[in-house]
């Protein structure tokens, strides 16, 4: 508005705060994750905080163990309600091996493709949930660098349950999962004592994910 109260065009329109994220959750589904419904409860609590839709946040889920399964693609569902129903139905695929590098790499190469619903120019976020050292950790450094090169923000969650059950040292495992997280690590890495405790980090994780939108 000019001094004479005439409408004039501003030089730049006011920027809307973006609510667009493409989020792929990479779940360890090996047998040692127990009980599995702690994972689906975690998913439920996290997803119900999201405004999911083709023009808002999109969510895809990948499960890995000995191999990798796309549970659903980024563009499969167009509402939070639909995603919640689908996530509740995800069954544990099992297996003894934890191929974390394979899981992350598959998410990067496949889940984040336009064919599976990824959108150009939209921030990419990966959430990795695992409970054990990877059996393919020799590949991890390169896989993480590839994610970094593609500007994929990574949140990693270490579940210490199987280590605590076996009275094993968690030090090496925690270091590995920290290495997966984006910098600064303290904002992108979480650890929980066991699977039942996953729900305790949902609020903070959600806040940190959506802080990326700003």
């Amino acid at each position: 508005v000019s001094p004479t109260f005439q409408v004039v065009n501003s030089f730049a329109p006011v920027q809307e705060c973006s609510t667009q994220l493409d989020i792929v959750i990479v779940l360890d589904g090996s047998n040692s994750i127990y009980p599995w419904d702690s994972v689906t409860a975690f998913l439920n609590d996290l997803l119900e905080r999201m405004d999911i839709g083709p023009k808002q946040t999109q969510v895809g889920i990948v499960q890995y163990g000995e191999n990798v399964t796309h549970e659903f693609n980024l563009n499969k569902y167009s509402s939070t309600e639909e995603v919640l129903v689908a996530a509740k139905k995800i069954v544990q695929r099992g297996g003894r091996q934890t191929m974390t590098a394979l899981g992350i790499d598959t998410a990067r190469k496949e889940a984040f493709t336009e064919a599976r619903g990824a959108r150009r120019g939209v921030k990419k976020v990966m959430v990795i949930v695992t409970d054990g050292e990877s059996h393919d950790n020799h590949r991890l450094k390169k896989v993480i660098q590839d994610c970094e090169d593609e500007n994929i923000q990574r949140f990693s969650i270490a579940i210490l349950g199987s280590y605590n059950r076996g009275n094993l040292s968690t030090e090496k495992f925690v270091e590995e999962i920290k290495s997966i997280a984006s910098e600064p690590t303290e904002k992108h890495f979480f650890n929980v004592s066991d699977e039942l405790a996953l729900v305790t980090i949902v609020k903070t994780l959600g806040e940190r994910i959506f802080a990326l939108e700003a």
Partner: antibody, heavy 124, light 108 residues
Framework: EVQLVQSGAEVKKPGESLRISCKGS????????IGWVRQMPGKGLEWMGI????????RYSPSFQGQVTISADKSISTAYLQWSSLKASDTAMYYC??????????????????WGQGTLVTVS | EIVLTQSPGTLSLSPGERATLSCRAS???????LAWYQQKPAQAPRLLIY???RRATGIPDRFSGSGSGTDFTLTISRLEPEDFAVYYC?????????FGQGTTVEIK
């Protein structure tokens, strides 16, 4: 649909050998442990042992170690329980069950979420 | 080895009544790793409850589990005719699985 289908009832004489089977379907059979449970006539349930069909890693209950052999053939999604020399006291119903949980390292945990229909073994 | 003792051995009740079954462990069950199974005559056991209080898929909400440490309870809030059966508790926190001797819930 997850299913465990066991072989039919057997009547044997003491000293004979026997192998009973449990075929899994409706899930990745090589990715879950399968346990065996005995129920003697009119009695409760006893865990015998457990096998991972993917690599045939096997654990036994101390009470059954050396008494039975548990094996698997992953190519046909089947687990087996066998005796080399049956005794009258082996007369029982035998169930296989899928473990939702794990038995890696020194630690085993989990519940049995799907069960076979049972195989009745009579030794007399 | 953890020994599980179930009580009572037999529970005589009428449909619509509440059933409370007890399972006591000889030592603490780690992480509340205790399950309950139902077995009807000539049938395989069926999983009801795991991790002490989580209902298995398809189990009606009249079944509930509680407890931790050494004392666990299975409660059937209102008995239906199909609930008359034998119930077993099972612990799985010690790299071995042990079952209780069972509680029979019979029609009064």
């Amino acid at each position: 649909e997850v299913q465990l289908v066991q072989s039919g009832a057997e009547v044997k004489k003491p000293g004979e050998s026997l192998r009973i089977s449990c075929k899994g379907s409706g899930y990745s059979v090589t990715s879950y442990w399968i346990g065996w449970v005995r129920q003697m006539p009119g009695k409760g349930l006893e865990w015998m042992g457990i096998i991972y069909p993917g690599d045939s890693d096997t654990r036994y209950s101390p009470s059954f170690q050396g008494q039975v052999t548990i094996s698997a053939d992953k190519s046909i999604s089947t687990a087996y329980l066998q005796w080399s020399s049956l005794k009258a006291s082996d007369t029982a119903m035998y169930y296989c069950a899928r473990l939702q949980g794990d038995c890696s390292g020194g630690t085993c945990y989990g519940h049995f979420d799907y069960w076979g229909q049972g195989t009745l073994v009579t030794v007399s | 080895e953890i020994v599980l003792t179930q009580s009572p051995g037999t529970l005589s009740l009428s449909p619509g009544e509440r059933a409370t079954l007890s399972c006591r462990a000889s030592q603490s069950v780690s992480s509340s790793y205790l399950a309950w199974y139902q077995q009807k005559p000539a049938q395989a056991p069926r999983l009801l409850i795991y991790v002490a209080s989580r209902r298995a898929t398809g189990i009606p909400d009249r079944f509930s589990g509680s407890g931790s440490g050494t004392d666990f309870t299975l409660t059937i809030s209102r008995l239906e005719p199909e609930d008359f059966a034998v119930y077993y508790c099972q612990q799985y926190g010690t790299s071995s699985w042990t079952f209780g001797q069972g509680t029979t819930v019979e029609i009064k």
